[in-house]
């Protein structure tokens, strides 16, 4: 399988909320026997291996805001701790996760990596990650809204932040 | 919370089999990770046993394969040890516990543990 | 198997002060850029308690003076400063490869 990000940069205004999003795709496998751990963390760029480092997320490590199910279930993070932080992490039935970070300031800027993990017993896993750039902006410069610019093409979209 | 709690007996003749069981609350077994067995020496030296797959395979330390078994009753969320042909050697504090993945895997929780005797 | 070598076996450390506890495994046991290292901390009459996982991450609700730190062979736990509470028999255990092991504790006394 691989991860796909469906937008390779988002431009925020401050204050807004912005959803990142990450995709799954190719053969899942559903088995009794197959866990996917799921996460998001931070990362800098100029790395020799994109997404190698791992840093939290405002103060919340890859551990919190982890999600761990099944192949075929849906999951969230604990809502209690993330949303104290303005976040929540999900995942769908249909292979998307995402998370969504409420009232962007200019400290959210910066590189964020998914990750899915592929765990089968007895502890083999497999990793595939994506990564995307978050950029907040002040000023008269800044967007009204989220533009997203997707990974394959140039192409923006204007989206409305929910 | 999840809980863990071992339960079994105190104390067991030579070449007889030893059974305890894991009594698992606040979490299903089938939806977690992989559910293990370790045991406490009294010099205090720890060693893994083996554990049960959420999907109920098994793993087993190579040093007791031939001797020991691994099952789980779904229905009432436990799981469970089978020592066969023991040995003074044997005796130990018996842990169950939990793994967790974190670009690891760990034990992150843990029974409180029962004390097995091998004695006749 | 992997052999956990753990030094000192016992040390005592004033209040206040750093403890340093090491743990050398007979063969590398990362993956992928992660340690597959662990630190536990056991008091008489406990099960052992989760302080570090991945040779470096603190455990949810585990205090800040705990810090683990290394790669490949080499992994070390840094207690500082202590605390009265923290005497205790601190373990490690890799869980690269099967079957998983422990090292042989380092007994921590406050002075």
């Known amino acids: 399988f691989k991860v796909a990000t469906p937008y390779s940069l988002y431009v925020c205004p401050e204050g807004q909320n912005v959803t990142l999003t990450c995709r799954l795709l190719g053969p899942v496998d559903k088995g009794h026997d197959v866990t996917f751990y799921k996460t998001w963390y931070r990362s800098s760029r100029g790395e020799v291996q994109t997404c190698s480092e791992r840093r939290p997320i405002r103060n919340l490590t890859f551990q919190d805001l982890h999600l761990h199910h099944g192949g075929h279930q849906a999951a969230n993070t604990s809502h209690d701790l993330a949303q104290r932080h303005g976040l929540e992490s999900a995942s769908d039935h249909h292979g998307n996760f995402s998370i969504t970070m409420r009232n962007l300031t200019l400290l959210d800027s910066g590189l964020y990596c998914c990750l899915v993990v592929e765990i089968r017993h007895h502890h083999s896993e497999h990793r595939v990650h994506g990564a995307m750039e978050l950029q907040v902006q002040t000023g008269k410069d800044a967007p009204s809204n989220c533009v997203v610019y997707p990974s394959s093409s140039q192409d923006s979209e204007n989206i409305t932040a929910a | 919370d999840v809980q863990l709690q071992e339960s079994g007996p105190d104390l067991v003749k030579p070449s007889q089999s030893l059974s305890l069981t894991c009594t698992v609350t606040?979490?299903?077994?089938?939806?977690?990770?992989?559910w293990h067995w370790i045991r406490q020496f009294p010099g205090n030296k720890l060693e893994w046993m083996g554990d049960?797959?959420?999907?109920?395979?098994?793993n087993y330390n190579p040093s007791l394969k031939s001797r020991i078994s691994i099952t789980r009753d779904t229905s009432k969320n436990q799981f469970f040890l089978q020592l066969n042909s023991v040995t003074t050697e044997d005796t130990a504090t018996y842990y169950c516990?939990?793994?967790?993945?974190?670009?690891?895997?760990?034990?992150?929780?843990w029974g409180a543990g029962t004390t097995v005797t091998v004695s006749s | 198997d992997i052999v956990l070598t753990q030094s000192p076996a016992s040390l005592a450390v004033s209040l206040g002060q750093r403890a340093t506890i090491s743990c050398k495994a007979s063969?590398?046991?990362?993956?992928?850029?992660?340690?597959?290292m662990n630190w536990y901390q056991q008091k008489p009459g406990q099960p052992p308690k989760l302080l570090i996982y991945?040779?470096?991450n603190l455990e949810s609700g585990i205090p800040a003076r705990f810090s683990g730190s290394g790669s490949g062979r080499d992994f070390t736990l840094n207690i500082h400063p202590v605390e009265e509470e923290d005497a205790a028999t601190y373990y490690c255990?890799?869980?690269?490869?099967?079957?998983?092991?422990f090292g042989g504790g380092t007994k921590l006394e406050i002075k």
């Open positions: 516990a939990r793994d967790y993945y974190g670009f690891s895997w760990y034990f992150d929780v």
């Open positions: 606040g979490y299903s077994i089938t939806g977690g990770y992989n």
């Open positions: 049960i797959h959420k999907s109920g395979s098994t």
């Open positions: 063969q590398s046991v990362d993956y992928d850029g992660d340690s597959y």
């Open positions: 991945g040779a470096s």
């Open positions: 255990q890799q869980s690269i490869e099967d079957p998983w092991t």
